[in-house]
């Protein structure tokens, strides 16, 4: 029904009130629900009304505003505190400790997250986001120097459906349209062979603990398993012979690796040659990832500070040691 | 199959010295944090020492610090207990455990070794 | 360093019967906590980690609970190979502790 310049939705009453003409619902279970569109963010819950915008949100704290969009600092909260000289007996000795991995502990010094002190130093979001890796959407983290919210805004639930056989069958130059979805890591590629590579700038240079024989024999499963985690592929990259740049890495020089060494009667430079893991040059290419989702990475940067988001996390399946973001050409170093 | 055997344990001295052995097998021993862990006779378990092998990160029981030594050869995959200063409280079976978390020393031991035995008795 | 309390330190139980072993921590350890089983002559065996998750090879009889400072392990129906002694331990802050144990006998 209409009334003048007022068009009312399906279900509405016209209204005359004193103020002009109104749409009104006498009954909400025969109008087109506010709520239809999830208008409530972060978290709030949404409740039908009667007249527009035809909803109400109840927010939870630490926001409000029509659609719960408003941040509000908690008055007084106490910034976080770290178990001072425990922690700091206990950072940065290559070994993450739980009471230590917060982000006013450093995460440890580093020990819990790849060596990257803070892996949310470029978010700028009122909140903080490290804090809000829960399983549900924040949009005020849902941008990429604030890693996209851990990927909670786009059905982080989804699962590959044949995860056994996508995984057997991943980046093995056969299309296999079942795989060919972000979940199940758009099948390494394979079926977008005839695609020209979007490569996003800059090189992961990661630390894996698997000597490097190792790695390349494992290497479909390793680059889908951080491909799962960023979203997108990952590959190998060659240097200019053309040879994939996986190098044998002897280990930090840490201060008590060192000491470990002089409480062992070892020979002068025994153990300085030997084998610790893999020195590893990744690439992205992005070719499918920006056909299907707006979250790419279009540098290496904030892909590396995922990575040890999920180190902080735990949920890294492969001993990964450090990662960092190369933006020029890498020069073979150990 | 992952797999832990201690040796070197045995009767000792009040006052002496022994080194304890943790051979690994069936994973990449640098890869997990270490544990000694012992059980006096008729008692419960105590926590010993640890390390990480990739970075020789240590941490003690107060029990034992200043006393014990773990170490680790990656080249070998056995971590070792150096026990001095040996007292009667010492007298233990002493397993060696593995952590179940890469670099976390906050993870559970999830694969333990059959225990050696050390008796500190005059 | 943290304390870890066990409940009962032993119990008489027959088979089939559920079993409640409780586990309190003398400060917060969050869900960094683990249960182990131990056989006479033999060495501790990882039942539960983070407080609730079963490791391999746990048959699903075994169950644990609880986070911060009260913790329990749970055996729905006491099976023979189950009579042993149990114990808790945080990892949580080192040094890591374990409770006393609570020794599960038959009746």
């Known amino acids: 029904s209409s009334c003048g310049q007022v068009k009312c939705r399906k279900g509405e009453q016209c209204v005359h009130t004193a103020s002009g003409p109104r749409c009104f619902c006498p009954s909400p279970r025969d109008c087109e629900s506010g709520c239809a569109s999830s208008p409530c963010q972060h978290g709030g819950s949404c409740h039908p009304q009667r007249q527009p915008p035809y909803y109400s949100c109840q927010c939870a704290p630490p926001f409000s505003g029509s659609r719960c969009e408003l941040y509000t600092a908690p008055p007084s909260t106490p910034p976080a505190t770290c178990l001072s000289q425990y922690c700091a007996d206990k950072a940065r000795d290559g070994v993450c400790d739980e009471a230590c991995n917060s982000h006013a502990c450093q995460w440890d010094g580093g020990d819990c997250s790849l060596t990257m002190e803070n892996p949310w130093a470029n978010c700028s979001s009122p909140l903080p986001c490290w804090d809000y890796i829960n399983n549900q959407c924040d949009e005020l983290c849902n941008t990429v120097e604030c890693l996209f919210d851990n990927f909670e805004c786009q059905g982080n639930s989804k699962t590959c459906k044949y995860d056994k056989y996508c995984a057997d069958h991943f980046k093995d130059n056969h299309c296999d349209q079942g795989c060919n979805s972000e979940e199940c890591g758009w099948d390494g590629l394979d079926c977008a062979a005839d695609q020209p590579e979007n490569l996003a700038e800059g090189t992961l240079v990661i630390v894996v603990l698997m000597p490097p024989e190792q790695l390349l024999q494992d290497a479909r499963s390793f680059l889908r398993a951080l491909g799962t985690l960023l979203h997108t592929n990952l590959r190998i990259k060659r240097d200019s012979q053309g040879e994939l740049m996986v190098y044998p890495y002897y280990g930090e020089k840490s201060a008590a690796m060192k000491k470990q060494r002089m409480t062992r009667r070892s020979l002068p430079g025994e153990q300085e040659q030997e084998v610790a893991g893999s020195k590893v040059f990744l690439e992205i290419d992005n070719r499918q990832c920006v056909q299907d989702s707006d979250h790419c990475f279009k540098n290496t940067d904030a892909a590396a500070a995922l990575l040890a988001s999920h180190a902080i996390q735990g949920t890294l399946s492969y001993p990964l040691v450090s990662v960092v973001s190369e933006s020029l050409t890498p020069e073979r170093t150990q | 199959e992952v797999q832990l055997v201690e040796s070197g344990g045995g009767l000792v001295q009040p006052g002496g010295s022994l080194r304890l052995s943790c051979a690994a097998s069936g994973y990449t021993f640098s890869s997990y944090g270490m544990s000694w862990v012992r059980q006096a006779p008729g008692k419960g378990l105590e926590w010993v020492s640890y390390?990480?092998?990739?970075?020789?990160?240590?941490y003690y029981a107060d029990s034992v610090k200043g006393r014990f030594t773990i170490s680790a050869d990656t080249s070998k995959n056995t971590a070792y207990l150096q026990m001095n200063s040996l007292r009667a409280e010492d007298t233990a079976v002493y397993y060696c455990?593995?952590?179940?978390?890469?670099?976390?020393?906050?993870?559970?031991?999830?694969?333990w070794g059959q225990g050696t035995l050390v008796t500190v008795s005059a | 360093d943290i304390q870890m309390t066990q409940s009962p330190s032993s119990l008489s139980a027959s088979v089939g019967d559920r079993v409640t072993i409780t586990c309190r921590a003398s400060q917060s350890v969050r869900s960094f906590l683990a249960w182990y089983q131990q056989k006479p002559g033999k060495a501790p065996k990882l039942l539960i980690y983070r407080a609730s998750i079963r490791a391999s090879g746990v048959p699903s009889r075994f169950s644990g609970s609880g986070s911060g400072t009260d913790f329990t392990l749970t055996i729905s129906s006491l099976q023979p190979e189950d009579f042993a002694t149990y114990y808790c331990?945080?990892?949580?802050?080192?040094?890591?502790?374990f409770g006393q144990g609570t020794k599960v006998e038959i009746k």
């Open positions: 331990q945080q990892y949580y802050i080192s040094p890591w502790t």
């Open positions: 455990a593995r952590h179940s978390g890469y670099y976390r020393i906050s993870s559970a031991m999830d694969v």
């Open positions: 390390i990480y092998p990739y970075s020789g990160a240590t």
